[in-house]
Interface confidence: low
């Protein structure tokens, strides 16, 4: 008997209160199917029902967490039904408070190098899940290390490529509620750098300014970068601007920093809209120093 294929859209990780579409596809083209849930709480809306093409399930509660299979109608089978499909595990998030997700040594990772993603919580989670935005396959399951202050897991990811870069979130769960997940951690953008040639970074009116004076940093390149990213050493996050084509054939973005009070080392990167987590090599560092201020970074 041909097994149908069961899938979940937009994915298998669903926030409490949201909806998920379960789609059962038969290679023989039959579009009627039944759904069953193997574990977790029973879901009465599945009982003795025939679905056509897909089933919109929700708003989901922890009761919907569990393993689903479908059987498609199959007139040539003695029972009238196909063999059960592949299992799809629906995980419901928002049951516990969110963990924290960090990258060591940082979220900007050179192409080919390794980054450690650390998910931690003051809740004693025995399992963690790591999920990349836009990926429909099951999240990565990781065993947590329990300690008096809570729990954590370290995941070594690499060698870094554009395929591994993206927006990551982690979730925690406890063994006796394996498909009921915490709220997601705050998103962490893991970026692969060093894929393209470095842009140039300059300062107007210059890299040394009076305290309170306006300064603008210009990032430019002859590469067709859509976006430039400006980062300051020892600071999380970055400024992001769309590149503009200049008369001289360079693609440039101007970052007005406004009246500056503290200096620092700045770098900029270029990237393309189509690959937002894949950046160029960093520009040479530009030290901006502020005079008339006791603090020089």
């Amino acid at each position: 008997q041909d097994k149908p294929f069961l899938s979940a859209w937009p994915g298998t990780v669903v926030s409490e209160g949201q909806h998920v579409t379960l789609q059962c596809r038969s290679r023989l083209g039959f579009n009627e199917f039944s759904l069953s849930k193997e574990d977790g709480m029973p879901v009465p809306e599945l009982y003795n029902r025939i679905f056509r093409n897909s089933f919109l399930m929700g708003p989901v509660t922890p009761a919907h967490a569990g393993t689903y299979r479908c059987c498609s109608s199959h007139p040539h089978s003695p029972t009238g039904w196909s063999a059960p499909s592949n299992p799809v595990v629906i995980m419901v998030t928002g049951v516990h408070r969110k963990p924290s997700l960090l990258a060591h040594p940082g979220p900007l990772v050179k192409s080919g190098e390794t980054v450690i993603l650390q998910c931690w919580s003051d809740v004693r989670f025995e399992r963690f899940l790591l999920h990349r935005e836009g990926i429909t396959e099951d999240p990565l399951r990781l065993v947590g290390q329990l300690h008096d202050a809570g729990s954590q897991v370290n995941y070594s990811m690499g060698p870094m490529t554009p395929a591994l870069a993206g927006t990551y979130r982690c979730f925690g769960s406890v063994t006796h509620l394996p498909y009921e997940l915490s709220a997601p951690s705050d998103p962490l953008d893991i970026v692969v750098v060093g894929l393209y040639g470095k842009p140039s970074l300059s300062a107007q009116p210059g890299p040394t300014v009076q305290a309170g004076e306006n300064v603008t940093l210009s990032c430019s390149s002859r590469s067709l970068f859509d976006i430039y990213h400006l980062s300051r050493e020892a600071e999380a996050g970055e400024l992001r601007l769309t590149a503009v084509l200049r008369v001289n054939g360079t693609f440039q973005a101007n970052f007005p920093l406004g009246p500056v009070t503290h200096g620092g080392n700045y770098r900029c990167f270029g990237s393309f809209r189509a690959l937002p987590h894949a950046w160029s090599d960093p520009s040479d560092p530009l030290p901006v120093s502020v005079t008339g201020n006791s603090r020089h970074l």
Partner: antibody
Framework: QVQLVQSGAEVKKPGASVKVSCKAS????????MHWVRQAPGQGLEWMGY????????NYNQKFKGRVTMTADTSTSTVYMELSSLRSEDTAVYYC??????????????WGQGTLVTVSS | DIQMTQSPSSLSASVGDRVTITCKAS??????LSWFQQKPGKAPKTLIY???RLVDGVPSRFSGSGSGTDFTLTISSLQPEDFATYYC?????????FGGGTKVEIK
């Protein structure tokens, strides 16, 4: 249907060890926590810890740490609880209890019939 | 460790009475609480989990309520087979702890 069948009563001397078994049937053994709970005569219930047979992960009540060992034999779907350095206050009925009323979900769903362990010189 | 204080420790009631047993947690356990019934010489039986969800096959005269630190088990109309000892259990974190029990006796 789910069944948890425990080994028979034991009489032990102080300082000895006891190993109680709990044979499971009627469900996927490796998918559910098995907890151990004890009850001294005329007293309340006390949680000792659990084992997750899927990966042999354990979590023990600190009160019993160093004295209790929980193991699982997946070939026979049996969980064992061994308690060492027995003293008279360990005299109790020992229960195994499977987690999750609906799947691996919540609290304790199914209980063994209990095993009386008597510690006496 | 989280302490579970159950009250009363015993009560006398008649068939048909409405019976209420309370359990108080020493800190917030959200709704991670179960109620059990135990008869002499028998293993406990789960009645309610996640504070208010009734186990399949348990009569609807049993109900649970509460969240956070204060929880209640109610038997709306006591039946002869309900005379037993009742325990609460929290499973919000390790170690799990039980309440001291409430013995429901015939008046």
């Amino acid at each position: 249907q789910v069944q948890l069948v425990q080994s028979g009563a034991e009489v032990k001397k102080p300082g000895a060890s006891v190993k109680v078994s709990c044979k499971a049937s009627g469900y996927t053994f490796t998918s559910y926590n098995m907890h151990w709970v004890r009850q001294a005569p005329g007293q309340g219930l006390e949680w000792m810890g659990y084992i997750f047979p899927g990966d042999a992960g354990t979590n023990y009540n600190q009160k019993f740490k160093g004295r209790v060992t929980m193991t699982a034999d997946t070939s026979t779907s049996t969980v064992y609880m061994e308690l060492s350095s027995l003293r008279s206050e360990d005299t109790a009925v020992y229960y195994c209890a499977r987690s999750g009323y609906y799947g691996n979900y919540e609290g304790f769903a199914y209980w063994g019939q209990g095993t009386l362990v008597t510690v006496s010189s | 460790d989280i302490q579970m204080t159950q009250s009363p420790s015993s009560l006398s009631a008649s068939v048909g009475d409405r019976v209420t047993i309370t359990c108080k947690a020493s800190q917030d356990i959200q709704s991670y609480l179960s109620w059990f019934q135990q008869k002499p010489g028998k293993a406990p039986k789960t009645l309610i989990y996640r504070a208010n969800r009734l186990v399949d096959g348990v009569p609807s005269r049993f109900s649970g309520s509460g969240s956070g630190t204060d929880f209640t088990l109610t038997i709306s109309s006591l039946q002869p087979e309900d005379f037993a000892t009742y325990y609460c259990l929290h499973y919000a974190e390790f170690p799990y702890t039980f309440g001291g029990g409430t013995k429901v006796e015939i008046k």
